[in-house]
Amino acid sequence: NSYYDKVLAHSRIRGRDQGPNVCALQQILGTKKKYFSSCKNWYQGAICGKKTTVLYECCPGYMRMEGMKGCPAVMPIDHVYGTLGIVGATTTQHYSDVSKLREEIEGKGSYTYFAPSNEAWENLDSDIRRGLENNVNVELLNALHSHMVNKRMLTKDLKHGMVIPSMYNNLGLFINHYPNGVVTVNCARVIHGNQIATNGVVHVIDRVLTQIGTSIQDFLEAEDDLSSFRAAAITSDLLESLGRDGHFTLFAPTNEAFEKLPRGVLERIMGDKVASEALMKYHILNTLQCSEAITGGAVFETMEGNTIEIGCEGDSISINGIKMVNKKDIVTKNGVIHLIDEVLIPDSAKQVIELAGKQQTTFTDLVAQLGLASSLKPDGEYTLLAPVNNAFSDDTLSMDQRLLKLILQNHILKVKVGLSDLYNGQILETIGGKQLRVFVYRTAICIENSCMVRGSKQGRNGAIHIFREIIQPAEKSLHDKLRQDKRFSIFLSLLEAADLKDLLTQPGDWTLFAPTNDAFKGMTSEERELLIGDKNALQNIILYHLTPGVYIGKGFEPGVTNILKTTQGSKIYLKGVNETLLVNELKSKESDIMTTNGVIHVVDKLLYPADIPVGNDQLLELLNKLIKYIQIKFVRGSTFKEIPMTVYRPAMTKIQIEGDPDFRLIKEGETVTEVIHGEPVIKKYTKIIDGVPVEITEKQTREERIITGPEIKYTRISTGGGETGETLQKFLQKEVSKVTKFIEGGDGHLFEDEEIKRLLQGDTPAKKIPANKRVQGPRRRSREGRSQ
């Protein structure tokens, strides 16, 4: 079934309570415009944002009978001339009579007559109508023939985009059949379709069709009021393409529309071939969009590639939410023109600073005031990381101008980075020389402490991304942050007692759930000694507070539990609820404290892995005293496993090895070697996973998977020599697919995808040493076996 028929069927369903063959129509209040009721319009009770009243009329082809419900009688069938009277198109019938068309449409043949309604004739320009009436034998007859087709065509035969030759000089009738059930002929709407006649069919339309002989190009060349647009189309080499065959819709801005543009904006765009072409193409659709087909907001792709939203408010058409169409449906032989009184500027023709919306005005105003706007050259490429207006507190705005300028510089990047270019672990350099880290989560992208909101755009000389907060690049390491805050003095002392201080000092990517001194309330010095005395227990507890990867609270999907694997090996559960981070269902006191090697979330309770039993009565008593949120298991005699430690040394080593890469599955006790051609430079770092340091190659654009398993011996291959940024870049372009470790006798499961994304973050090489022992020695690199 065609769209028209489907909507008609829906109208019939809505009208069946009124009797057989009754259709529900919706009439826009204050107008005579009626539409068969679509499902959407029925439930909205509105068309084009205007309230509608429901009318019940006989469905096309049926009529009422006195004293009977609904429309039980079928309309009489007659020849086309008689049918004009049946459907109420009496003016068209009269004109058919006086122009001597009557004999033709009463006689042999098969015709489709697109008959203007009586109202359509009344709305026709009086001079045109008078001209037709003064020359009935030629002008009027030609005009009526141009409404006719030499065969019967029902709405199901009127396919979208069809051009049917009319009975006047084969002039084309442009058919459009839209998904909302609207059928148009040269943009005139079929208001009563499919009235079958013995020698054809009559479709009543809402306006008189005027003859079409010109193209869009012809129209532009003849219309003085479009001289600006015409000139711009010539400049952009687009005018001729508007003379070619097609089904275009052109939203043509008048000269007045161009006058509304600030002169500087126009001068810039017209001087930039790419921008001016984008501007012009943004006004053109590759589909024919008649105004009568717009019954609600819809998005259309322009020739420029971006979309515009075309909507309606009563009789007015709006574009991107603004009423601006002042003359509709100028039909040409290759499309339709709507005159608009504003120039549509696509993002691709805008300067990056012009991309900011109403919610980022504080940022753009400051950028201008502090002289940063002038550094955004039209031929440069930049990215603005624009915080929303309410991200700027009064304290920030009243800061010393120099400080404020430094803060703003953290929000402007030296290069154009689109949304799709961002990846986890990426480092972005600001115009102030600061480096910002990118964190990509399942439903969020964050830069340092601040996460994006919707509304990223790409302009002519850059991109803009919108952020919830002011971006604050980290200055201190995890260890330094803890040390400068008295709240963490006990945790810090325990950390040092467990020989874990280095872990939080060296570069890397960690999430630390840092317990405040309140978490240790009531712990006596004897109990402290007890805890310190069992190094394995202490390390297990502390490392349960540390997770590989940077997890920003604001990056979590609200209300969903995120399961992370800690460096101790057990799982920790995080959830974002009402701007608060829950850690194992405990409320975090403060979250997203950024550091150079990770992020801190503050908790006021000690965390403990629920799956690890305690085998010592005294320790159990202490832990029960400190930890109330879970029931700790007691298994007499059980001990905490030793967690091998790793010294983190930020270094990169260049390796020169000959031979093909060799990837093998490794079983416990085997030696692993990877041989690589040429001069790769590898950035290495280690993660402790299930108590085993796993050494990983950084490759940021791929999602890599790790299977945890037993300890493996490594063959280390290293050579000295410095490295350059260039060789590092060369090597990083080498594809890394999957990092795997074989589990001897294990279940071989993979981590959840979300965990995996985080496991491969970090940037420091490491070498494994016995627990609790620090080693200084030559720089080394280890390579884990990989399967591809």
């Epitope: 001289s227 600006s228 711009a232 000269n255 161009f258 006058e259 543009l261 001087g271």
Partner: antibody
Framework: QVQLVQSGAEVKKPGASVKVSCKAS????????ISWVRQAPGQGLEWMGW????????NYAQKLQGRVTMTTDTSTSTAYMELRSLRSDDTAVYYC???????????WGQGTLVTVSS | QSVLTQSSSASGTPGQTVTVSCSGS????????VNWYQQLPGTAPKLLIY???QRPSGVPDRFSGSKSGTSASLAISGLQSADEADYYC???????????FGSGTKVTVL
């Protein structure tokens, strides 16, 4: 064809005002704007401002703001430029030019010489 | 004092190519388009090139314009005696919010 015909030469005393007219023909007057440009003897060109013949909106050069007024009469397709508080350095040939912004100053009037002398 | 800088004169023999240069700043030529006007002796100026390189109808293709960074140039190939005139470059200046002209270059056909 497009034509812009300007009023004749004027001699004015310092402190006086001058009003130069520019009658357009050969195109739809209200579809275009008019810019005014002046040229001091032996010197280069200086843009004075622009007026929309459709809306009457104006955009004046900062230097002349407060002294210049541009107007149009759509019934006669004529643009006017009035300059007040004349000084000797206002002595110049004053040109009107059709300006549709996209194609700036595509047709020019023949020029009107205004001499400011005591 | 013109905002855009032009060489005061240029000359060539008939048939030669003469180039007229125009230098500006980031707020005018650097950000916006350049237009060129020809003023024959004793007449009103005439639009020669608009939007850096576009010729209005009626202007011979011997005239061509280009722009790079903060400077622009007008090339006149196949020089003719009728080309003897003053040539002005012009651009919008964002900082002054004014349309600015160059000082003009007198082209002489030897």
């Amino acid at each position: 064809q497009v034509q812009l015909v300007q009023s004749g030469a004027e001699v004015k005393k310092p402190g006086a005002s001058v009003k130069v007219s520019c009658k357009a023909s050969g195109y739809t007057f209200t579809s275009y704007g008019i810019s005014w440009v002046r040229q001091a003897p032996g010197q280069g060109l200086e843009w004075m401002g622009w007026i929309s013949a459709y809306s009457g909106n104006t955009n004046y050069a900062q230097k002349l703001q407060g002294r210049v007024t541009m107007t149009t009469d759509t019934s006669t397709s004529t643009a006017y430029m009035e300059l007040r508080s004349l000084r000797s350095d206002d002595t110049a040939v004053y040109y009107c030019a059709r300006d549709i912004l996209v194609v700036p100053f595509d047709y020019w009037g023949q020029g009107t010489l205004v001499t400011v002398s005591s | 004092q013109s905002v855009l800088t032009q060489s005061s004169s240029a000359s060539g023999t008939p048939g030669q190519t003469v180039t007229v240069s125009c230098s500006g700043s980031s707020s005018d030529i650097g950000s916006n388009r350049v237009n060129w006007y020809q003023q024959l002796p004793g007449t009103a100026p005439k639009l020669l090139i608009y939007s850096n390189d576009q010729r209005p109808s009626g202007v011979p293709d011997r005239f061509s314009g280009s722009k790079s960074g903060t400077s622009a140039s007008l090339a006149i190939s196949g020089l003719q005696s009728a080309d003897e005139a003053d040539y002005y470059c012009a651009a919008w200046d964002d900082s002054l919010s004014t349309y600015v002209f160059g000082s003009g270059t007198k082209v002489t056909v030897l």
